[in-house]
């Protein structure tokens, strides 16, 4: 179980790196973030570490109310605070593992 979670964490972070470069990856991550109401791997600040992402920006799928451009110059109160690894991991532990 721990190995699966560690792999999922690594994979999620890897996909974040590809987010700005790959539309397919972007759509998968957007779906995960929107469905699980989460943002980033550990939390939204992970997006700041992606070199090609502006530091005042998260994907729109992080927003509580998703609209085009809502992730630009975001306010913390307008986005999901919880990280996706913890949130999706909890769901996996409960329903799959």
């Amino acid at each position: 179980r721990d190995k699966v979670m560690s792999e999922f964490n690594n994979n999620f972070r890897q996909q974040m790196e590809n987010y700005p470069k790959n539309n397919h990856t972007a759509s998968i991550l957007d779906r995960m973030q929107a469905d699980f109401k989460c943002c980033g791997a550990a939390n939204y600040t992970d997006w700041e570490k992606i070199p090609s992402m502006s530091k005042n920006r998260v994907p729109d799928s992080c927003c509580i109310n998703v609209t085009v451009g809502c992730g630009i110059n975001f306010n913390e109160k307008a986005i999901h605070k919880e990280g996706c690894v913890e949130k999706i991991g909890g769901w996996l532990r409960k329903n799959v593992l």
């Epitope: 600040t45 700041e48 502006s54 530091k55 005042n56 920006r57 451009g69 809502c70 630009i72 110059n73 975001f74 306010n75 913390e76 109160k77 307008a78």
Partner: antibody
Framework: QVQLVESGGGLVKPRGSLRLSCAAS????????MNWIRQAPGKGLEWVSY????????YYADSVKGRFTISRDNAYNSLYLQMNSLRAEDTAVYYC????????????WGQGTTVTVSS | DIQMTQSPSSLSASVGDRVTITCRAS??????LNWYQQKPGKAPKLLIY???SLQSGVPSRFSGSGSGTDFTLTISSLQPEDFATYYC??????????FGQGTRLEIK
């Protein structure tokens, strides 16, 4: 009413330190990012630093990086700027500024506090 | 970093004139452009946000337009209290938050 009041400015010698404070009232302080913006005598506006709602995220202009530290205390509706290793070029009026973010613009400014760095 | 360039840097006009100030961004900033007015010895005041939205309490003679890289602030009929310095500012890609160098509007 919505208000920002800066304090702590004054005359300081080069390489000295100063701590600016900003007291916020009339709004929910932690709903907003906060900025320090300065204006040297006869010059334009220069962004200095900003801090996120929770204080988790902080950024600085290259000109002050490593010398200035921004912080906030949401329990006391207060914003701070610790300024160390001050230089003559830091002489300016320093404004505390509220920022709702997104595309809304910086909508509330304090009256400013003057910092003079001179020997 | 995104650079903001305002023109002109100073401008003389008379009460009742229509005045236009332009601001150009070094790369596209969509509509993330704000305009501020500053009078001597006072703090700046937000006039226009999101390129064209009038901030509450600002007279309707002020208007903004543009998107991408080119923006304008227009004062349809100058009033005595409008003589001040005007700044544009982008919030599309920060840090840093960047301002134009300012346009000083003087009485002719």
């Amino acid at each position: 009413q919505v208000q920002l009041v800066e304090s702590g400015g004054g005359l300081v010698k080069p390489r000295g330190s100063l701590r600016l404070s900003c007291a916020a009232s009339g709004f929910i302080f932690d709903d907003y990012f906060m900025n320090w913006i300065r204006q040297a005598p006869g010059k334009g506006l220069e962004w200095v630093s900003y801090i996120s709602n929770s204080g988790n995220t902080k950024y600085y202009a290259d000109s002050v990086k490593g010398r200035f530290t921004i912080s906030r205390d949401n329990a006391y509706n207060s914003l701070y700027l610790q300024m160390n290793s001050l230089r003559a070029e830091d002489t300016a009026v320093y404004y505390c500024v509220r920022d709702p973010r997104s595309y809304y613009g910086m909508d509330v400014w304090g009256q400013g506090t003057t910092v003079t760095v001179s020997s | 970093d995104i650079q903001m360039t305002q023109s002109p840097s100073s401008l003389s006009a008379s009460v009742g004139d229509r005045v236009t100030i332009t601001c150009r961004a070094s790369q596209s900033i969509s509509s993330y452009l704000n305009w501020y007015q500053q009078k001597p010895g006072k703090a700046p005041k937000l006039l226009i946000y999101a390129a064209s939205s009038l901030q509450s309490g600002v007279p309707s003679r002020f208007s903004g337009s543009g998107s991408g890289t080119d923006f304008t602030l227009t004062i349809s009929s100058l009033q005595p209290e409008d003589f001040a310095t005007y700044y544009c500012q982008q919030s599309y890609s920060t840090p840093p938050i960047t301002f134009g160098q300012g346009t000083r509007l003087e009485i002719k």
